[in-house]
């Protein structure tokens, strides 16, 4: 697992505890909360990150205030169960034995039930729409420049293969980034679109998960791109199963 050897840290995940106690004195990093070893050469899975967030020091919440243009945090924080690969288990339950099924990004996709609730498989989120509204600027950004900058960001910062950034739409002041990744398209070693979207979301909030890197400094041809609202939509390979009561509420 690639970790910065000199002072033994995890460049891609600050919510880790690292020590030079791996084979041959190599630096090894484990995620807070789960204690699972993480690969510091790539993004950590969203499940392990959410679990780490629940057991992080209080300082992680009190000393890192979201930036002034941060989105409202409605990401439904909970302490998830992750499988040995760090993915969300299909069924999640809380301490009061209320259970529900989630998709591959940990978002609830069924009504809540009891311990008898069955979630047969982890349904893959294959399409993510990230809606951003940027702060007012003197003029609109050039669409192709904006497109190129956001693709570069996902490729370089989040190591997401360019083929998974399906489109970047722009109608001032709204930007929509489309990420698509079917089960059949995702090869071993490919960053998951759900993980990339989560890192991006935390970056936008001014809560970067990267160790020793400043927050996001998005610029299009030198002009700062400051996001003031973000909404993320998740589309699953199999439609969610909510009761009609919820749909008509």
């Amino acid at each position: 697992h690639t970790a910065a050897q000199d002072n033994c840290t995890c460049p891609t995940n600050k919510m880790t505890v690292c020590s030079p106690d791996g084979p041959g004195g190599r630096c090894q990093c484990r995620a807070l909360g789960s204690g699972m070893a993480v690969d510091c050469s790539t993004l950590t899975s969203k499940c392990l990150l959410l679990k780490a967030r629940m057991s992080a020091p209080k300082n992680a919440r009190t000393l890192v205030r979201p930036s002034e243009h941060a989105l409202v945090d409605n990401d439904g924080l909970y302490d998830p169960d992750c499988d040995p690969e760090g993915r969300f288990k299909a069924r999640q339950c809380n301490q009061t034995s209320v259970c529900w099924c989630v998709n591959s990004v940990g978002v609830r996709r069924t009504d809540k039930g009891d311990l008898s609730l069955r979630c047969d498989e982890l349904v893959r989120t294959h399409h993510i729409l990230i809606d951003l509204r940027h702060r007012p600027t003197a003029g609109a950004f050039n669409h192709s420049d904006l497109d190129a900058e956001l693709r570069r960001l996902f490729r370089e910062r989040y190591r997401l293969h360019p083929k998974f950034v399906a489109a970047v739409h722009y109608e001032q002041p709204t930007i929509q980034i489309e990420l698509r990744q079917n089960t059949s398209q995702k090869a071993a070693g490919d960053v998951d679109i759900g993980d990339a979207a989560y890192y991006f979301e935390r970056d936008i909030k001014g809560e970067s998960l990267f160790q020793g890197r400043g927050g996001l400094d998005l610029r299009v041809r030198g002009e700062p791109l400051q996001v003031e609202r973000t909404l993320i939509y998740y589309l699953d390979e199999i439609p969610p199963k909510f009761s009609m009561k919820r749909l008509t509420a």
């Epitope: 600050k14 205030r65 970067s208």
Partner: antibody, heavy 118, light 106 residues
Framework: QVQLVQSGAEVKKPGASVKVSCKAS????????MNWVKQAPGQCLEWIGI????????TYNQKFQGKVTITVDKSTSTVYMELSSLRSEDTAVYYC???????????WGQGTTVTVSS | DIQMTQSPSSLSASVGDRVTITCQAS??????LAWYQKKPGKAPKLLIH???NLQTGVPSRFSGSGSGTDFTFTISSLQPEDIATYYC????????FGCGTKLEIK
């Protein structure tokens, strides 16, 4: 290699102010928090406050609120701590210390002695 | 505010001895405790973080244990160069140091 280099010793009169600097090199400056710690003669180490260089946010130990102001100059990768209305009890060695990802202090400056004497 | 009670405040031991220092937090701090070594005229040096994780380059004779409110720092076989003052630091909720343990050679 990470280095935190602090400004030199200061001798000040009661009521005056002093500004101590801490210049960072060897790693991303905005990627880590910076802290100030006080050690008065024969006393315990005391945490003074923290700054997030990326956003400029500060949090202070209540005991030092109103006494200390921590600022940052990103262009020179330097953090400053200003002590105002100096009194004899402000005589101490002041250290800057970098906060790692989980906030414990992994690298320290060499310390700056501030002496308050009439 | 979290208080850290460190003991003993000073201790004298012989080269090769096993030395133990304790730190008690006034409330649960999980495992968010670090240990530092400070020599006169020098800056503190990080030895251990997250209760038991040795910082790179720190000799394995140093170790830490504990969780919640009670923590222990151990030097398994005291060496002459270990003469210093040792401090604990809680970094769960803001930051509080213990008042230090001055270690001397008998």
């Amino acid at each position: 290699q990470v280095q935190l280099v602090q400004s030199g010793a200061e001798v000040k009169k009661p009521g005056a102010s002093v500004k101590v600097s801490c210049k960072a090199s060897g790693s991303s400056f905005t990627g880590y928090t910076m802290n100030w710690v006080k050690q008065a003669p024969g006393q315990c180490l005391e945490w003074i406050g923290i700054i997030n260089p990326y956003q400029g946010d500060t949090t202070y130990n209540q005991k030092f609120q109103g006494k200390v102001t921590i600022t940052v100059d990103k262009s020179t990768s330097t953090v400053y701590m200003e002590l105002s209305s100096l009194r004899s009890e402000d005589t101490a060695v002041y250290y800057c210390a970098r906060g790692a990802g989980l906030y414990y202090f992994d690298y320290w400056g060499q310390g700056t002695t501030v002496t308050v004497s009439s | 505010d979290i208080q850290m009670t460190q003991s003993p405040s000073s201790l004298s031991a012989s080269v090769g001895d096993r030395v133990t220092i304790t730190c008690q937090a006034s409330q649960d701090i999980n495992k968010y405790l670090a240990w530092y070594q400070k020599k006169p005229g020098k800056a503190p040096k990080l030895l251990i973080h997250y209760t038991s994780n040795l910082q790179t380059g720190v000799p394995s004779r140093f170790s830490g244990s504990g969780s919640g409110t009670d923590f222990t720092f151990t030097i398994s076989s005291l060496q002459p160069e270990d003469i210093a003052t040792y401090y604990c630091l809680q970094y769960d909720d803001l930051f509080t140091f213990g008042c230090g343990t001055k270690l001397e050679i008998k």
